[in-house]
């Protein structure tokens, strides 16, 4: 189906609830080349058309993954299940390149935060990626939002260029990632 851009508090969203990327104030239907404008050119996977793309329509290709920036509000768990229904998982950040790409995308949505695939049971237990892999703070630091009133923010979201912990029940947008083999 045709994806139509609309203006919403200065942000770009798709009518079907997914955010692609801001394209130099161009609010028309994004083209393949305009998607490539939103990532580092040498890192973008070039495709010759929808049929040859390893990603579904409306997903952004970067290196060996497809990304969907969902603009429907959900808890962390609800966001995880939403990604599952799309055959993907909440974002797992594997490299500084990938982190830079993600920051570039979400920075065009300064009013919004996006769940990623990090959580923990409680503060005494280390952060864990959704696939069960360990989290290394060498890649990025998680800024805490913990207060006396809100002592256990055990899920993680990204807001502009900063990654925060947050209460898992707070409704937010999310980033789904689907890895593919080259």
């Amino acid at each position: 189906t045709m994806a139509i851009w609309r203006s919403n508090s200065g942000s770009n969203t798709l009518e079907n609830g997914y955010f692609l990327s801001r394209n130099k104030e161009n609010h028309s239907q994004p083209t393949q080349s305009s998607l490539e404008d939103s990532v580092t050119p040498t890192k973008a996977v070039k495709t010759t058309g929808v049929l040859s793309s390893p990603c579904p329509p409306n997903w952004i290709i970067y290196e060996k993954s497809c990304y969907l920036f969902s603009m429907s509000l959900n808890s962390w768990d609800g966001s995880k299940r939403q990604c599952w229904q799309l055959g993907s998982n909440l974002l797992k950040i594997d490299s500084s390149n990938e982190l830079g790409f993600i920051v570039k995308q979400v920075s065009s949505q300064p009013d919004n935060s996006f769940w990623i695939g990090l959580s923990r049971p409680q503060t005494e237990v280390p952060w864990l990626w959704e696939d069960g892999s360990t989290f290394s703070s060498n890649l990025f630091q998680i800024r805490t939002t913990a207060t006396q009133e809100n002592p256990s923010p055990n899920c993680v979201w990204i807001h502009v260029s900063v990654i925060y912990d947050q209460l898992c029940s707070v409704p937010s947008y999310s980033i789904c990632e689907k890895k593919f083999s080259m």
Epitope: P121, Q122, G132
Partner: antibody
Framework: QVQLVQSGAEVKKPGASVKVSCKAS????????MHWVRQAPGQGLEWMGW????????NYAQKFEGRITMTRDTSISTAYMELSRLRSDDTAVYYC???????????WGCGTLVTVSS | DIQMTQSPSSVSASVGDRVTITCRAS??????LAWYQQKPGKCPKLLIY???DLQSGVPSRFSGSGSGTDFTLTISSLQPEDFATYYC?????????FGPGTKVDIK
């Protein structure tokens, strides 16, 4: 596919030590916690602790603190669990298990029977 | 330590039966609970994690539910290969702990 291959059965005297190995393949060894779980004959499962193969940090169940050591050799993708000052009630099958989502144990080694007998 | 209890300790059932096993935690553990199946002489097999998420490759007749302190594993239609012992495990706090197990045997 993920595989965890453990070392063979051991018979030990009380007071001795045992070191069990667990060789991993089919995934990036340093990306996932490795847990050790034991099961005494006819009994249930008991979590002993984990090692983070990437950084080498460990977390032991307090019950075993002071006599358990978990190590790893990333060059050969192998995790080790050493238990010292063995007692007869340490007789059990010792499993290594790879961490999966939500701190579950999705992949298990075949187990190593350690018998402690005088 | 968080104590895990299971009931019943054993259940006799027939092929095709619906079997329900409950697990209770001594304190709230949110959804940080897993279920395992173990057959005699074999290593445990993960069935459910995160209280209700089905592990890849596990038949859909297995389902998990619950949050907080009370959890349930349901086998909707028992198959011959399902006769085994089932354990729950909490992953909320250290040390991780298992329930004592529920043995499902043939009636």
């Amino acid at each position: 596919q993920v595989q965890l291959v453990q070392s063979g059965a051991e018979v030990k005297k009380p007071g001795a030590s045992v070191k069990v190995s667990c060789k991993a393949s089919g995934y990036t060894f340093t990306d996932y916690y490795m847990h050790w779980v034991r099961q005494a004959p006819g009994q249930g499962l008991e979590w002993m602790g984990w090692i983070n193969p990437n950084e080498g940090d460990t977390n032991y169940a307090q019950k075993f603190e002071g006599r358990i050591t978990m190590t790893r050799d990333t060059s050969i993708s192998t995790a080790y669990m050493e238990l010292s000052r063995l007692r007869s009630d340490d007789t059990a099958v010792y499993y290594c298990a790879r961490n999966t989502g939500a701190y579950s144990f999705g992949y298990w080694g075949c187990g190593t029977l350690v018998t402690v007998s005088s | 330590d968080i104590q895990m209890t299971q009931s019943p300790s054993s259940v006799s059932a027939s092929v095709g039966d619906r079997v329900t096993i409950t697990c209770r935690a001594s304190q709230g553990i949110s959804s940080w609970l897993a279920w395992y199946q173990q057959k005699p002489g074999k290593c445990p097999k993960l069935l459910i994690y995160g209280a209700s998420d089905l592990q890849s490759g596990v038949p859909s007749r297995f389902s998990g539910s619950g949050s907080g302190t009370d959890f349930t594993l349901t086998i909707s239609s028992l198959q011959p290969e399902d006769f085994a012992t089932y354990y729950c495990q909490q992953a909320y706090g250290f040390p991780f702990t298992f329930g004592p197990g529920t043995k499902v045997d043939i009636k």
